[in-house]
Interface confidence: low
């Protein structure tokens, strides 16, 4: 299936260029999308172009400006929130990234009201978190680890936490591990829906082993970064969870949630908090062995002022075949009578799908079904779910959003999005405005992106947000690659693979074979999606043939493909991404002299165990940031999905499984070996342990570091990186600069 | 200065159709809603519905639903309002009127009225 | 849809006294930013004219003796020194919700 029919024609072919590796780097194709952001049901906010703050209403079709750039300017804004009563705005600067979604900055309350900045009892700084009540203008802030609350924004504050200490107590925030692997937020504090009550969580790190790394700097010494990290098998953070009334907070003071009996027996994680009701919350535990979740939804005796978490309203989730849930364990949606919710597990056939449970899990009814997936769940109204699959025609790379009423009986089913734009766009994902008044669609390709703002009701498109028609325009004399999707079908096992080829593809030709591999437990990488990136250059312009296959371990079709991998990480992923280079020199085209891999991360890991599997398929490869071995990664992700390093537990496949015990098979390849050395994330001590072996076992690889770079190498290393791996895999492929 | 001036008094029979115009000036007219509002004699005022120039959103009152018809033509900045099978209690001044430009429902700038007879 | 009950009927003052007409909706038609209530004037032959918008916000152009309170169902217009050219029908209207409604008039005539 062409999802990019090439425009060249013979009579253009002189007007039309290929893609530069400039291009790229300098994001000259690069889409724009429009996410309203919302504030009733219909109205939203939008940041303009030249950095207004507009407030857009759907039904009267005015739009005023709320907040002038000369504001925003004043204090060096790059983000805003809108009190919900809409009298104040916190304006943020001095934007300092941490980890993955972790900042500081420096927040100002500017009144409407009045137009002016609020004075006295001014926010510290610089603050880790804040947030809006979702009623009138309460403000909650995290400030060294401690957690205060403001009634109003001119108010002294009032301080929750006294017991916050940097890299030992985090309140209201995450610590590292939470954040990246469990939370994915920058925050652990959660007000309920009217904003009487704050909860929050209390992560202590106090035994947690530190990873500890050089920070070059500019100095004359180096600073050594610190942080709790806890590493496969080692202690984990210790959470509580906390609920204060924010109207009287000194009255009880926070009253700790009490965790479920079956969890506590033994380490556990917090997963994640959902408001009921004002005096209704939800909590999610899992067990440290990831297959056992419980759901528990608790209330708030007034008579005692605590929370009450009945065992009849704890539902345990649990997987006999792999992990808890997806990446995640799903969140539970609630229906309008505050206690029955609908939520995505799988079903008897291994099947991710929603749920509607009203008493037990046991006697859950199952609302979607099928050889597909239910990905997400965005809204419940009283007549209505909205959620996404990769049901349409078959192809798990695909998001359509559908629309199930709930109101009538039997409930009926609509794809909402399967035929808007049926060439241009085949994967979704949406954003709904309070009651599902009104939503934006934003489709992501397989065509240009487009955003567009619906009827709720109707589902009629209203308007279009974004067209890219810059982009578009841009884009008509560049010689794009073709790109198909497809499946193979191997030893009962199908794996879809996305190609990339070259403008003028010839199948009577040779053409060199770039994987590229991510592969990683519960990801997808053949996805409906527009991109114009490096792989995309490779192909226009140095004619390569660039695949990316999905095998074992990934995710959206079925628990078998993905607990495929279950105690057994490095093994599936790289015999799938073997079976499928086989596949494509059995297709005629590829030149199998010059076939090589690369990959990021966890495909940094796949393709070096893939150059090193022996095979003599790969002639080079390339591996950034790899994990080397389990032991060396994340407790929360890795023992997900690989157990413990114990004796009694999982050591031997940690240990059979590093990309070290394979140095010698690196001999016969062009291995190109990349790491920034403040990589927080997958540490630089993985690479460095690669590069020991293969110099212990006197193998020659090439190798290039970032300093002071993290796992995601910005900036200027960007360009340097792909400069760098452009002019490996020319050479590799014995192609002209 | 913003102005809304509006096409001359009818007289119409029953049944027939009446289509008031209301021609915009001083303002970029497809930004702010038109409103009609009507007024029969010696009553109060009674709000028909809304027409958006720039987006095309319109809405009608229930009571007025399936016999009113609300356009628009950008390029001369007029309004129209159209009310079909007219019956003698449509006898009155119909007026169009801006909606302010602080948004939120207030009418700042009036037409100054069409008065519409039906009468047999 | 929300009603207005505007009291009294009519208002019979004399210039230089001061007015206070109410409007009281069904409903509240407040939210916790804003009243989305306004107030007219009409004067024989005329199209209404915007004096109060939001409750208590003047419009440009009218003159302070004009004055507008209240929130959640109960809303006042204030006239504080009565002018001969006062001497017209008033009109409430809210915007809260669909369909727009207008209360049924006060008049205030001249004593």
């Known amino acids: 299936i062409v999802l990019r029919p090439s425009r060249v024609h013979n009579s253009e072919e002189n007007t039309m260029r290929a893609l530069t590796l400039k291009d790229i780097l300098n994001g000259t194709f690069s889409y724009k999308t429009f996410f309203p952001n919302w504030i009733s049901g219909q109205e939203y906010l939008h940041q303009s172009a030249d950095n207004n703050i507009v407030l857009y209403n759907i039904e009267t079709g005015q739009s005023y400006t709320i907040l002038s750039n000369r504001t925003m300017k004043s204090v060096n804004a790059s983000n805003y929130g809108l009190s919900p009563d809409r009298q104040f705005v916190y304006l943020e600067s001095d934007y300092s990234k941490l980890w993955r979604y972790s900042y500081t900055a420096t927040y100002y309350i500017y009144d409407l009201s009045n137009g002016e900045f609020v004075r006295g009892n001014e926010l510290p700084r610089p603050i880790q978190y804040l947030c809006w009540s979702p009623v009138g203008s309460k403000l909650a802030y995290v400030y060294q680890n401690n957690i205060y609350l403001k009634q109003r924004p001119g108010d002294p504050p009032f301080q929750i936490t006294f017991n916050g200490r940097e890299n030992k107590i985090f309140n209201g925030i995450p610590d590292w591990v939470y954040e990246e692997e469990m939370l994915a937020t920058k925050y652990a504090l959660w007000w309920s829906p009217n904003g009487k009550f704050l909860a929050y969580a209390e992560f202590n790190d106090t035994d947690i082993p530190v990873i500890a790394y050089s920070y070059y700097g500019d100095e004359q010494y180096p600073r050594t970064i610190n942080i709790p990290y806890p590493k496969a098998g080692a202690k984990n953070p210790v959470v509580r969870i906390f609920i204060i009334d924010t109207t009287y907070p000194a009255y009880v003071g926070p009253q700790e949630v009490p965790v479920p009996a079956m969890i506590a027996s033994s380490d556990y994680y917090f997963s994640w908090l959902t408001w009921v009701t004002d005096e209704r919350v939800c909590l999610q535990w899992l067990k440290r062995v990831q297959n056992v979740s419980v759901l528990s939804i608790c209330d708030f005796r007034e008579d005692w002022q605590t929370w009450d978490c009945p065992k009849t309203q704890e539902h345990i989730e649990e997987s006999r075949t792999g992990w808890a849930g997806g990446f995640f364990v799903s969140t539970p949606v609630f229906s309008y009578d505050a206690i029955s919710y609908y939520k995505i597990f799988s079903d008897k056939d291994g099947y991710k799908h929603i749920h509607y449970i009203k008493d037990t899990v046991e006697n859950a009814i199952q609302i979607t079904s099928g050889k597909w997936e239910a990905i997400n769940i965005f809204r419940v109204t009283q007549d209505s779910l909205f959620y996404s699959s990769n049901e349409f025609e078959e192809y798990p790379g695909r998001r359509n959003i559908y629309r199930i009423s709930i109101g009538s009986y039997p409930p009926s089913k609509k794809c909402v999005t399967c035929h808007l734009r049926k060439e241009r766009c085949q994967y979704y994902t949406a954003s709904f405005s309070d009651y599902a008044k009104y939503y934006a669609l934003v489709c992501y390709g397989p065509g240009i992106p487009i955003s567009t703002l619906h009827d709720g009701r109707t589902d009629q498109e209203i308007k279009i947000l974004e067209e890219n028609k810059e982009l578009e325009n841009a884009l008509k004399n560049i010689q794009l690659p073709k790109e198909e999707i497809k499946k193979l079908e191997v030893d009962e096992i199908t794996l879809w693979y996305k190609m990339i080829l070259p403008p003028q593809f010839d199948r009577s030709k040779k053409y060199p074979l770039l994987i590229q591999v991510y592969g990683g437990p519960c990801s997808q990488s053949v996805r409906s999606v527009f991109a114009v990136n490096w792989i995309s250059y490779l192909a226009s312009k140095e004619g390569m043939v660039i695949a990316l296959v999905d095998g074992r371990g990934t995710a959206f079709q079925g628990d078998k493909l993905l607990y495929a991998v279950y105690r057994k990480l490095g093994v599936y992923e790289v015999e799938d991404q073997i079976t499928a280079v086989r596949k494509f020199i059995e297709m005629g085209f590829i030149d199998e002299k010059r076939i090589a891999i690369w990959g990021w991360s966890y495909g940094g890991y796949v393709s070096s165990l893939a150059l090193a599997s022996g095979t003599g398929l790969f002639k080079c490869g390339i591996a950034v940031a790899p994990v080397s071995s389990w032991e060396y990664y994340a407790s929360v992700y890795t023992e997900r999905f690989m157990g413990l390093p114990t004796k009694d537990d999982n050591l031997e496949h940690y240990k059979n499984s590093t990309v070290m015990a394979r140095a010698e098979y690196f001999r016969n390849v062009d291995y190109l070996l990349i790491h920034g050395t403040a990589d927080d994330n997958v540490h630089f001590q993985n690479s460095a342990q690669i590069a020991k072996a293969l110099v212990n076992a006197q193998v020659d690889f090439q190798a290039m570091w970032y300093s002071d770079q993290n796992h995601g190498l910005s900036g200027l290393s960007t360009n340097h990186l792909y400069t760098h791996m452009t002019h490996f895999l020319k050479q590799c492929f014995s192609l002209s600069d | 200065q913003v102005q809304l001036v509006q096409s001359g008094a009818e007289v119409k029979k029953p049944g027939a159709s009446v289509k008031v115009s209301c021609k915009a000036s001083?303002?970029?007219?497809?930004?702010?809603?038109i409103h009609w509002v009507r007024q029969a004699p010696g009553q109060g005022l009674e709000w028909m519905g809304w027409?958006?120039?720039?987006?095309?959103?319109?809405k009608y009152a229930q009571k007025l639903q399936g016999r009113v018809t609300m356009t628009t033509d950008t390029s001369t900045s007029t309004a129209y309002m159209e009310l079909r099978s007219l019956r003698s209690d449509d006898t009155a001044v119909y007026y169009c009127?801006?909606?302010?430009?602080?948004?939120?429902?207030?009418?700042?700038?009036w037409g100054q009225g069409t008065l519409v007879t039906v009468s047999s | 849809e929300i009603v207005l009950t505007q009291s009294p009927g009519t208002l019979s003052l004399s210039p230089g006294e001061r007015a206070t007409l109410s409007c009281r909706a069904s409903q509240s038609v407040s939210t916790s930013a804003y009243s989305y209530m306004h107030w007219y004037q009409q004067k024989p032959g005329q199209a209404p004219r915007l004096l109060i918008y939001l409750a208590s916000n003047l419009e440009s152009g009218i003159p302070d003796r004009f004055s507008g309170s209240g929130s959640g169902t109960d809303f006042t217009l204030t006239i504080s020194r009565l002018e001969p050219e006062d001497f017209a029908v008033y009109y409430c209207?809210?915007?809260?919700?669909?369909?727009?409604?207008f209360g049924q008039g006060t008049k205030l005539e001249i004593k």
């Open positions: 209207q809210q915007s809260r919700e669909l369909p727009y409604t």
């Open positions: 009127a801006r909606h302010g430009a602080t948004g939120r429902g207030a009418m700042d700038y």
């Open positions: 027409i958006h120039p720039g987006s095309g959103s319109i």
């Open positions: 001083g303002y970029t007219f497809t930004e702010n809603i």
